[in-house]
């Protein structure tokens, strides 16, 4: 059994999240993940989910009673989602930490917008594909 | 020329982001994107970048002077990044809108954690692969 399972059960107790009523009004993540089978689509969604959990864990970083559990789960997330690649994890963290209200960050983001847009579709790297071809792609 | 280009130039003027000094102290997104060649890795990073831009645009939604430019760019992002798939865009938006300080959201997130973790690595869908195989994956 992966180490995170025991620690996640510990967090369930701490957050009182083991009761069946927690599942009322649908799921947060599981229903969405069920919708997407293609790896690249899953990564788009999982990227947001993982950043949510990291933010959540950050909010509880001073709570000693769950420290070990949180650290073990974060370690396992880094192994599973970032394939233990610290460079990937660091680049991800940089992106999640940019402040949208910082004027310098805003100017840089707008400055880079055209190039970012040009790279957004997979076709961007293999030659330009007519936009009309893409309109109804899944 | 894609419609977003003209509108992005308009935003550059508005944000005073056309000057060369904006590029001082490195890039926000372009340097990071350059590091990642594999499509799934790019999607992890682009997911965060796109959510940043949507947040930024939201902050300026009441500014009429750039409304048309913002709408055109958002539409083009939906075409390029979400392949014009409204369901994909909607699921993405749901994920970005969850509040990490909402107690019910916290409980649900912890309730779903084990299943989310089990799906994080690509191997999860094709049968379990020994975790030891993953330590240095890209």
């Amino acid at each position: 059994q992966d180490p995170y399972v025991k620690e996640a059960e510990n967090l369930k107790k701490y957050f009182n999240a083991g009761h069946s009523d927690v599942a009322d009004n649908g799921t947060l993540f599981l229903g969405i993940l069920k919708n997407w089978k293609e790896e690249s689509d899953r990564k788009i969604m999982q990227s947001q989910i993982v950043s949510f959990y990291f933010k959540l864990f950050k909010n509880f970083k001073d709570d000693q009673s769950i420290q070990k559990s949180v650290e073990t789960i974060k370690e396992d997330m880094n192994v599973k989602f970032f394939n233990s690649n610290k460079k990937k994890r660091d680049d991800f963290e940089k992106l999640t930490n940019y402040s949208v209200t910082d004027l310098n960050v805003q100017r840089k983001a707008i400055h880079e917008l055209i190039q970012v847009m040009a790279e957004l579709s997979p076709a961007a790297k293999t030659g330009k594909r007519k936009r009309s071809q893409m309109l109804f792609r899944g | 020329q894609d419609p977003y280009v003209k509108e992005a130039e308009n935003l550059k003027k508005y944000f005073n982001a056309g000057h060369s000094d904006v590029a001082d102290n490195g890039t926000l997104f372009l340097g990071i994107l350059k590091n990642w060649k594999e499509e799934s890795d790019r999607k992890i990073m682009q997911s965060q970048i796109v959510s940043f831009y949507f947040k930024l645009f939201k902050n300026f939604k009441d500014d009429q002077s750039i409304q048309k430019s913002v709408e055109t760019i958002k539409e083009d992002m939906n075409v390029k990044f979400f392949n014009s798939n409204k369901k994909k865009r909607d699921d993405f938006e749901k994920l970005t809108n969850y509040s990490v300080t909402d107690l019910n959201v916290q409980r649900k997130a912890i309730h779903e954690l084990i299943q989310v973790m089990a799906e994080l690595s690509p191997a999860a869908k094709t049968g379990k692969r020994k975790r030891s195989q993953m330590l240095f994956r890209g």
């Epitope: 992966d2 180490p3 995170y4 650290e71 073990t72 974060k74 370690e75 396992d76 880094n78 192994v79 970032f82 394939n83 233990s84 690649n85 610290k86 460079k87 990937k88 994890r89 660091d90 | 350059k34 590091n35 990642w36 060649k37 594999e38 890795d41 975790r131 030891s132 195989q133 993953m134 330590l135 240095f136 994956r137 890209g138």
Partner: antibody, heavy 121, light 110 residues
């Protein structure tokens, strides 16, 4: 101050076994991945095995897979390498090395002084 | 598995600048951090550069690291060479299933 002290090396016959230990101090041991790296006499460095901070993930070089086992006891701040079916080509100084983070063992920042393993009849 | 190729040896006079290259055979050099280790005779390796271009505290700023995506290689540059810089230097990176060291470069300060 970070300290890594290896022990357990020595002379062993081909086919024999040896268990190396690495006593760690000066840092929170369970928070960091650890590796074993070896260096044959007059040769370069060769990575052998690694283990994540919790011990949940392990990895091995092809040359030792199935013969060596890495483990750790976080309550004792100690890293181990169990070496079985030893061969002459396993003769080397074995270094224990600490990683910069808990989940990868690809960024080694501190090394022990090494312990010599000699496999010979 | 990929390989990291370094020159077997380099030599230069005191005060000069020397650059040691490390070329990755497959996989993007930019997608994985590169480390550089110095090993003096009879001693354990010590880190002189980590995460492509970062210097641990205590390592003089004469040591610098860089990566070049175009050539898929990393470089260690030592300026103002001193006699105590004479040592073996190893680059190191990793990929999806292993940690890999370069073969090592013997630096001789003439």
């Amino acid at each position: 101050e970070v300290q890594l002290v290896e022990s357990g090396g020595g002379l062993v016959q081909p086919g024999g076994s040896l268990r190396l230990s690495c006593a760690a101090s000066g840092f929170t041991f369970s928070s960091y991945a650890m590796s074993w790296v070896r260096q044959a006499p007059g040769k370069g460095l060769e990575w052998v095995s690694a283990i994540s901070g919790s011990g949940g993930s392990t990895y091995y070089a092809d040359s030792v897979k199935g013969r060596f086992t890495i483990s750790r006891d976080n309550s004792k701040n100690t890293l181990y390498l169990q070496m079985n079916s030893l061969r002459a080509e396993d003769t080397a100084v074995y270094y224990c090395a600490k990683d910069r983070v808990g989940y990868s063992s690809s960024l080694l920042d501190y090394w022990g002084q090494g312990t010599l393993v000699t496999v010979s009849s | 598995n990929f390989m990291l190729t370094q020159p077997h040896s380099v030599s230069e006079s005191p005060g000069k600048t020397v650059t040691i290259s490390c070329t990755r055979s497959s996989g993007s050099i930019a997608s994985y951090y590169v480390q550089w280790y110095q090993q003096r005779p009879g001693s354990s390796p010590t880190t002189v550069i980590y995460e492509d271009d970062q210097r641990p505290s205590g390592v003089p700023d004469r040591f610098s690291g860089s990566i070049d995506s175009a050539s898929n290689s990393a470089s260690l540059t030592i300026s103002g060479l001193q006699t105590e810089d004479e040592a073996d230097y190893y680059c190191q990176s990793y990929d999806r299933n292993s940690l890999v060291f370069g073969g090592g470069t013997k630096l001789t300060v003439l």
